[in-house]
């Protein structure tokens, strides 16, 4: 988790002088509770937006938007703490909106936005907006939280973001797999425009089961420049095991931008259809 273009952060708007500050996620009002605290945010919305940095890189960002309730507690509102928690790592990042002037009611509902939390593809986050000061220990909560799921690099708009491109999202190997005679598979895929090696990982399974009955790894050396974007054809020999008929072929590239952590592509070959043969009817029925 990180912030985008830190020097560009602003939260001021007409009628409010405001500054964005780094936060430890532990506001002072936790330690020194106040008697009068503001009510919670209203209509918290989290959306996926896209941000180009100063240099021109493209990142997915969480666009956070909320409004204030139209009650007198805005007289005691000193700011807001925005917290983003990445659920699978428990990593948290916070910023604080610090109001440098008192809020007053005006003809429109107060509305705040922030679009500088960079998020990762295929990750889920919990976004919380806490109004400050935070409530006393037994006070009503004055925060709102929402979960936010970021699409993976297969998503058309995510594909061209810098983190996805770095993991090889623009490479479409267009894998084809065909079963040959004599227990062999022919795997064909399109090479990318980089002189890097690939690995084909073959895992075979019985018809209706998920534990593997055969595994094989095949190394493909780095192609020469004249082979870029060409098809690579590999024939894999399978183990002659009856019923070990469902094959998953996974291609792992080792691009310089992502090394061992590049996006993998896979294709699956299903077991051949069994003809529906009727159950044989016995000639006689035993009586015992």
């Amino acid at each position: 988790l990180r912030l985008l273009d830190h020097r560009a952060l602003v939260c001021s708007q007409p009628g409010l002088n405001c500054t964005v500050k780094n936060s430890t996620c532990l506001d002072d009002s936790w330690i020194h509770p106040r008697n009068l605290t503001p009510s919670s945010p209203k209509d918290l919305q989290i959306q996926l937006h896209f941000a180009h940095t100063q240099q021109g890189d493209l990142f997915p960002v969480a666009h956070i938007e909320w409004t204030l309730q139209t009650d007198a507690s805005i007289l005691y509102l000193e700011g807001a703490e925005l917290s983003v928690l990445q659920l699978n790592t428990n990593e948290r990042l916070c910023v604080r909106f610090e109001f440098l002037s008192k809020l007053r009611h005006h003809h429109r509902r107060w509305r705040f936005t922030f679009s500088h939390f960079v998020v990762d593809p295929d990750q889920e986050y919990e976004v919380t907006v806490h109004h400050l000061p935070k409530p006393i220990p037994d006070g009503d909560p004055n925060h709102q939280s929402k979960n936010f799921l970021v699409p993976d690099c297969e998503h058309a708009r995510m594909k061209v973001t810098t983190p996805c491109m770095s993991s090889g999202s623009l490479w479409d190997p267009n894998i084809t797999v065909e079963t040959l005679e004599a227990h062999q598979l022919r795997v064909s895929f399109t090479l990318w425009n980089e002189s890097t090696h690939y690995q084909i990982l073959l895992t075979s399974f019985p018809h209706m089961e998920n534990h593997s009955c055969f595994e094989h790894m095949h190394h493909i050396p780095a192609p020469r420049p004249e082979e870029f974007h060409q098809r690579s054809n590999v024939t894999l020999t399978l183990r002659n095991l009856k019923g070990c008929c469902r094959h998953q072929v996974q291609i792992q590239p080792f691009f310089s931008s992502c090394l061992n952590d590049c996006l993998r592509h896979s294709a699956t070959v299903s077991c051949p259809e069994m003809p529906d043969t009727p159950e044989p009817i016995p000639d006689y029925m035993p009586l015992w």
């Epitope: 273009d5 560009a8 959306q47 996926l48 937006h49 941000a51 180009h52 100063q54």
Partner: nanobody, 125 residues
């Protein structure tokens, strides 16, 4: 101070072409990614295209992909946008914008650093 001056707009028939230019001054041009944004009559700002600092990477909104081409000349401190196969829906005021920019899934601009005064492009028969 930062100055961005667009030029090259005009009236053109559907299917026609234009080349927009943006002369930049008051900052180190080659240190910043640059953008083109546009605003159709009665609409908000829409992001159109971006180019990174050395011109090696370009991005386009879906509606202009394959028709518009962004480029830059760092020696001349100038940003360009080549508009081909123009459609009536491309009618808008076109602005160049410096540095960071944020937009939503529909390319509506939500934050923008600095933009010029704009040049009008009208596509009509």
């Amino acid at each position: 101070q930062v100055q961005l001056q667009e030029s090259g707009g005009g009236l053109v028939q559907p299917g026609g072409s234009l080349r927009l230019s943006c002369a930049a001054s008051g900052f180190i041009f080659s240190n910043y990614g640059m953008n083109w944004v546009r605003q159709a009559p009665g609409k908000g700002l829409e992001w159109v295209s971006n180019i990174n600092i050395d011109g090696s990477r370009t991005f386009y909104a879906d509606s202009v992909k394959g028709r518009f081409t962004i480029s830059r000349d760092n020696a001349r401190n100038t940003l360009y946008l080549q508009l081909n196969s123009l459609r009536t829906e491309d009618t808008a005021m076109y602005y160049c914008a410096k540095g960071s920019i944020t937009y939503d899934m529909d390319y509506r601009v939500t934050t923008i650093e600095e933009k010029g005064q704009g040049t009008q492009v009208t596509v009509s028969s």
